[in-house]
């Protein structure tokens, strides 16, 4: 990913820029964007970035707001790279079961599961 | 989702069944299944369930191992339902930015980000 700063720092900077430009971004009062109705964010990355695209096309560019959208596009690249790594490597059933157990464990403890 | 027990209980039961049937599941020594190489599990649900499908097709069915795969298929249904809820509801930019900020916040604190 052609980013000079590590992804973790990129995320921090993006959070700051989001705060800074909030007023400018909400200027369009008629715009409606799909928003996930649950907190399992990773399941919704596609929709989140589609929403970002919609927002970008409706926002007057210039100054550090451009930096915000540039950062978001680098974060998207990082996530796309992670998604590619989901199926790149074949391993023993043993390892697959370890991963599945870990996934279900995380689902059990960390997911917000509606009844 | 046509399941009598809540998803959280379903996940717990599935973890137990996975432990019980591990020996049977790893019996195929030459089988290789794609395993994600990072721990951001939610990004990889599609590949995880494809792997489960491969494993099911290679496993002798019968008894509670069938229950395991039935449970996993119900968990998949639940996750597919969650994914549908990612883009079902359009809301104000304000709400979208709240969600985006939350997403980046979670990414900042909870994701395992490689340098």
């Amino acid at each position: 990913i052609p980013t000079e700063i590590p992804t973790s720092a990129l995320v921090k900077e993006t959070l700051a820029l989001l705060s800074t430009h909030r007023t400018l971004l909400i200027a369009n009062e008629t715009l409606r964007i799909p928003v996930p109705v649950h907190k399992n964010h990773q399941l919704c990355t596609e929709e989140i970035f589609q929403g970002i695209g919609t927002l970008e096309s409706q926002t007057v560019q210039g100054g550090t707001v451009e930096r915000l959208f540039k950062n978001l596009s680098l974060i998207k690249k990082y996530i796309d790279g992670q998604k590619k790594k989901c199926g790149e490597e074949r391993r023993r059933v043993n390892q697959f079961l370890d991963y599945l157990q870990e996934f279900l464990g995380v689902m059990n403890t960390e997911w917000i599961i509606e009844s | 989702i046509p399941t009598e027990i809540p998803t959280s209980a379903l996940v717990k039961e599935t973890l137990a069944l996975l432990s019980t049937h591990r020996t049977l599941l790893i019996a195929n020594e030459t089988l290789r299944i794609p395993v994600p190489v990072h721990k951001n599990h939610q990004l990889c649900t599609e590949e995880i369930f494809q792997g489960i499908g491969t494993l099911e097709s290679q496993t002798v069915q019968g008894g509670t191992v069938e229950r395991l795969f039935k449970n996993l298929s119900l968990i998949k249904k639940y996750i597919d339902g969650q994914k549908k809820k990612c883009g079902e509801e359009r809301r104000r930019v304000n709400q979208f930015l709240d969600y985006l900020q939350e997403f980046l916040g979670v990414m900042n604190t909870e994701w395992i980000i490689e340098s």
Partner: antibody
Framework: EVQLVESGGGLVQPGGSLRLSCAAS????????MAWVRQAPGKGLEWVSS????????YYGDSVKGRFTISRDNSKNTLYLQMNSLRAEDTAVYYC???????????WGQGTLVTVSS | DIQMTQSPSSVSASVGDRVTITCRAS??????LSWYQQKPGKAPKLLIY???NLEVGVPSRFSGSGSGTDFTLTISSLQPEDFATYYC?????????FGGGTKVEIK
């Protein structure tokens, strides 16, 4: 039962070429990276080359880079090693091995001897 | 490239002995290490993968441990069929590199 059978070894002059083949059976060939590992007489093991599932990614050891080419035909369950510009130091038993990428060389062939000599 | 240094290069031992072979990587390889056994005129055979996972069919007297740069293969009670040469391999990155080998001989 897993089987890897190498063929194509033999005596060749320095500067000459040889093509090794490895026929695989007993497992899903396309689900494995494949590799060539060699062993010079009385010496240790040396990794030569590896190839990805579909053959789109290849890796080579420094000592063979630019001279050897690894390839595979998944429809024939066969792995190949094209060896050009052979040198005396390439003399070795060449083993074909299936590879689980981050874990090991799982299954090995019996090896085929390549002798480079004038 | 990652260098793998195996020691000792040879060891004389008797049946029933506990034998320990070590392998050191020139840089951190996490747990991406496998061990192989080779008998004269035969192909190598996988014993352990991922540092400590016993390959199917390998007797439980073989065990592996370590992480990062230092790794160990232990044969808890040497059997006549264990006299062979043992190699470690780093599976972390290309080029793959083997240790120089350890020959386990009869005392």
């Amino acid at each position: 039962e897993v089987q890897l059978v190498e063929s194509g070894g033999g005596l060749v002059q320095p500067g000459g070429s040889l093509r090794l083949s490895c026929a695989a059976s007993g497992f899903t060939f396309s689900h494995y990276y494949m590799a060539w590992v060699r062993q010079a007489p009385g010496k240790g093991l040396e990794w030569v080359s590896s190839i990805s599932y579909e053959g789109d990614i290849t890796y080579y050891g420094d000592s063979v880079k630019g001279r050897f080419t690894i390839s595979r035909d998944n429809s024939k369950n066969t792995l190949y090693l094209q060896m050009n510009s052979l040198r005396a130091e390439d003399t070795a038993v060449y083993y074909c091995a299936s590879q689980t990428l981050r874990e090991s060389f799982d299954y090995w062939g019996q090896g085929t001897l390549v002798t480079v000599s004038s | 490239d990652i260098q793998m240094t195996q020691s000792p290069s040879s060891v004389s031992a008797s049946v029933g002995d506990r034998v320990t072979i070590t392998c050191r990587a020139s840089q951190d390889i996490a747990n991406y290490l496998s061990w192989y056994q080779q008998k004269p005129g035969k192909a190598p055979k996988l014993l352990i993968y991922g540092t400590s996972n016993l390959e199917v069919g390998v007797p439980s007297r073989f065990s592996g441990s370590g992480s990062g740069t230092d790794f160990t293969l232990t044969i808890s009670s040497l059997q006549p069929e264990d006299f062979a040469t043992y190699y470690c391999l780093q599976d972390k990155e290309f080029p793959r590199t083997f240790g120089g080998g350890t020959k386990v001989e009869i005392k």
